[in-house]
């Protein structure tokens, strides 16, 4: 696993404990919480962040609209099971027994129920959408410069393919930013989007993973970008299961 | 290296118009924008306004709307920042900066600017 | 408009001593936080930004933490060229400084 070798420490993901104790005193790294090994030379799974997170101290419109099955993570933080490749299981239970299935970005999809509840598959987000709101700037961005930028950021930044970067919609002041990526898609060593977006929102609320760095300031072709609020819409290759109850 | 590198002090009458510059030098000048933030005698900093010398974009503190205007001379890579009306509460030390290149704070600051407005 | 409240406004150390700066907000601004160093007639140093991350060149005893509203500089152990005049600044929101905490020698 590929980590800082001079000072042992793991470029993607500062939630880790390094050591020197791999396979021919190689810096090998271990996410907190779980104590899984780490692959440092890209992102680490949003299930084993999450982990680590608990575990630390603390029309004719360009714009699009969510359909009627996306989900926006409503239930905030909790300490997920993550299964041995550190993806999400598709049932998560809290200490009072109270059970829920998520898809693969952790985001519950299904109503609260108790240990006899079953979650046959883990469901894939092929799907996010991210919503941005800037703040006012000098003049509008111009689009195609605004585009180039942030599909710069999430090919370099965060490793993503290119390909997966379906679209960015602006409409000023409003930012989307569409992913797309399908199971058949998705081949070994591709970042995942769900994990993309979950950088990129802990960057945008100053939050950054990555080792030795602040919070993420965008700027296009000079320009600051200050971003006033992010919304992240999740949708799923199989619609949501909620009782009517929840939907009115 | 990068350097900013302001004009000199000035001593301006009531009422008149002063215009201050900052020579740019070390890096490409249309990358970042220039910030003017001036600094009363012992007051805290004020932030001006900005403006992206890649298409002469401007924003404004809404405190210096109508007072103060920026401007910018690629050719040059030169910023410029005048105000008008000068009143003895405008007697300050007026700095260029710029951004950090990872972050929005000012890492790169010019000497500063006295101008003192006296009759 | 962000305001931004610093304290102390001044204090008196001696050199050796650990010096806290604090920064509140008037609103969560993300870590979206820069210190800055000033010494008479002299434009002011970046020391930190992002809240806690370093500039190069500057020294480690210097450290920046909090998150949300609230926001601490700390100086581990004053030295002589540390006595000035300390800014925060934040930039989630245009861009506001505090009043400033100016550090003498006791």
């Known amino acids: 696993h590929t980590a800082a070798q001079d000072n042992c420490t793991c470029p993607t993901n500062k939630m880790t404990v390094c050591s020197p104790d791999g396979p021919g005193g190689r810096c090998q790294c271990r996410a907190l919480g779980s104590g899984m090994a780490v692959d440092c030379s890209t992102l680490t799974s949003k299930c084993l962040l999450l982990k680590a997170r608990m575990s630390a101290p603390k029309n004719a419109r360009t714009l699009v609209r969510p359909s009627e099955h996306a989900l926006v993570d409503n239930d905030g933080l909790y300490d997920p099971d993550c299964d041995p490749e550190g993806r999400f299981k598709a049932r998560q239970c809290n200490q009072t027994s109270v059970c829920w299935c998520v898809n693969s970005v952790g985001v519950r999809r299904t109503d609260k129920g108790d240990l006899s509840l079953r979650c046959d598959e883990l469901v894939r987000t092929h799907h996010i959408l991210i919503d941005l709101r800037h703040r006012p700037t000098a003049g509008a961005f111009n689009h195609s410069d605004l585009d180039a930028e942030l599909r710069r950021l999430f090919r370099e930044r965060y490793r993503l393919h290119p390909k997966f970067v379906a679209a960015v919609h602006y409409e000023q002041p409003t930012i989307q930013i569409e992913l797309r990526q399908n199971t058949s898609q998705k081949a070994a060593g591709d970042v995942d989007i769900g994990d993309a977006a979950y950088y990129f929102e802990r960057d945008i609320k100053g939050e950054s993973l990555f080792q030795g760095r602040g919070g993420l300031d965008l700027r296009v072709r000079g320009e600051p970008l200050q971003v006033e609020r992010t919304l992240i819409y999740y949708l799923d290759e199989i619609p949501p299961k909620f009782s009517m109850k929840r939907l009115t | 290296q990068v350097q900013l590198v302001q004009s000199g002090a000035e001593v301006k009458k009531p009422g008149a118009s002063v215009k201050v510059s900052c020579k740019a030098s070390?890096?490409?000048?249309?990358?970042?924008?220039i910030h003017w933030v001036r600094q009363a005698p012992g007051q805290r900093l004020e932030w001006m306004g900005y403006?992206?010398?890649?298409?002469?974009?401007?924003k404004y503190n809404e405190k210096f709307k109508g007072k103060a205007t920026l401007t910018s001379d690629k050719s040059s890579t030169t910023a410029y920042m005048e105000v008008r009306g000068l009143t003895s509460e405008d007697s300050a030390v007026y700095y260029c900066?710029?951004?950090?290149?990872?972050?929005?704070?000012?890492?790169?600051w010019g000497q500063g600017t006295l101008v003192t407005v006296s009759s | 408009d962000i305001q931004m409240t610093q304290s102390p406004s001044s204090l008196s150390a001696s050199v050796g001593d650990r010096v806290t700066i604090t920064c509140k907000a008037s609103e969560d601004i993300f870590n979206r936080l820069a210190w800055y160093q000033q010494k008479p007639g002299k434009a002011p140093k970046l020391l930190i930004s992002?809240?806690?991350s370093l500039e190069t060149g500057v020294p480690s005893r210097f450290s920046g933490s909090g998150s949300g509203k609230d926001y601490t500089l700390t100086i581990s152990s004053l030295q002589p060229e540390d006595f000035a005049t300390y800014y925060c600044q934040q930039y989630w929101n245009t861009w506001t400084f505090g009043q400033g905490t100016k550090v003498e020698i006791k």
């Open positions: 070390g890096y490409t000048f249309t990358t970042y924008v």
């Open positions: 403006i992206n010398p890649n298409n002469d974009g401007t």
């Open positions: 992002g809240a806690t």
């Open positions: 900066a710029r951004p950090h290149f990872e972050t929005h704070a000012m890492d790169y």
